[in-house]
């Protein structure tokens, strides 16, 4: 069962799934000037059996100008940098090590992928939040949201994370607050 809405937004925070439940869809979006190849699937789907889950279909982008030039899936370093920060890339590798039954890992990037990934989550999915760079957690309550089914409708639980740009008097310049996410979870969707 797909979740009706996107996970809640938290000001000055991003959210990220460490692993994606079977049934999750990821749109095959291309950056400006590129489009999905004609024969390409509009989305990738997390599928699996009892022992193994993986993404069905591959996203492929081609230049809108060129007719039939399909590109390899491995991104060039320059394009990777454009898509996400280096820090985020290393954090994503952390997520790749996670192996949960019935879940897929973060799909690797494809060349000329759009800046932001659009996922369609399913009931039972958990996403984790952390304050973006330059902001700190004023309050560090449960920093996650779970898509639940109640009374036949899906809803995401409300994360109790408050991020602020105001520095606390006790904090010395250059002293950094640890980010509000368990085990330095990777970031993804920007919440504002």
């Amino acid at each position: 069962e797909l979740c009706d809405d996107d996970p809640p937004k938290i000001t000055h925070a991003t959210f990220k799934a460490v692993a994606y439940k079977e049934g999750t869809m990821l749109n095959c979006e291309c950056k400006r000037g590129f489009r999905r190849i004609k024969s390409g699937s509009p989305y990738m789907l997390c599928t699996g059996n009892s022992s193994h889950s993986s993404w069905d279909n591959q996203c492929q982008c081609t230049s809108s100008a060129a007719r039939n030039t399909t590109k390899q899936v491995t991104p060039q370093p320059e394009e990777q940098k454009e898509r996400k920060t280096t820090e985020m890339q290393s954090q994503m590798q952390l997520a790749d090590q996670v192996s949960l039954p019935g879940h897929c890992r973060e799909p690797p990037p494809w060349e000329n992928e759009a800046t932001e990934r659009i996922y369609h989550f399913v009931v039972g999915q958990t996403v984790y939040y952390q304050c973006v760079q330059g902001y700190r957690a004023l309050h560090r309550g449960p920093a996650e949201s779970v898509c639940k089914m109640t009374h036949g409708k899906t809803r995401w639980t409300q994360p109790q994370l408050i991020c602020t740009g105001e520095t606390e008097p006790s904090q010395f310049p250059g002293e950094e607050e640890p980010q509000a996410s368990p085990d330095g979870l990777p970031e993804s969707e920007t919440s504002r």
Epitope: T11, L138, H139, R140, G141, Q158, Q160
Partner: antibody
Framework: QVQLVQSGAEVKKPGASLKISCKGS????????MHWVRQAPGQGLEWIGV????????IYAQKFQGRATMTVDTSTSTAYLELSSLRSEDTAVYYC????????WGQGTTVTVSS | DIQMTQSPSSLSASVGDRVTITCRAS??????LEWYQQKPGKAPKLLIY???TLAEGVPSRFSGSGSGTDFTLTISSLQPEDFATYYC?????????FGQGTKLEIK
Amino acid sequence: QVQLVQSGAEVKKPGASLKISCKGSGYTFTDYAMHWVRQAPGQGLEWIGVISTYSGDAIYAQKFQGRATMTVDTSTSTAYLELSSLRSEDTAVYYCARGVTFDYWGQGTTVTVSS
Amino acid sequence: DIQMTQSPSSLSASVGDRVTITCRASQDISNYLEWYQQKPGKAPKLLIYNAKTLAEGVPSRFSGSGSGTDFTLTISSLQPEDFATYYCQHHYDTPYTFGQGTKLEIK
């Protein structure tokens, strides 16, 4: 069930200080930040500030900066609001409210400032 | 600070009516908006959070919509217990501010 129970009504003289409490029960107190909101007679709602029940870190509305102090005692699951240099305009009902979306509120504490 | 402006300030309606209250933010607040109901002598009660999510235990005749700067609270069929004052509030960033309120009265 979730409950926020506030201390009783107070009558104070101008220039005095005031400390009101809000005790949370039925949930993990440190999971939710606590906000303070006030409402003058016949008026709307005014946000005073928010405190982290986890760290004690707080942010105040500019109007209350320096005059309001929010604190928490996690051992008793209680949040406190202290207001100093009281004036007649501080006459209001003071509420505590829980979490990002203010999903539960205390019953209110009526504060009267009068000479 | 972000200003929240509600309209109308007061409204007379009858049981069974469909009622709409609007709230406008002075800048884009995405969907960081709540609606509360307050009855005389009582604390406010959360009705809608994140612009459109119905709070637990709130009847389905209440609904919220909007994003950015313009938001709406709709009561599809007024019940006697719905006569109260309604407030919108943003939690986009501190300071959180409330609308001035809309008093819903019996016609």
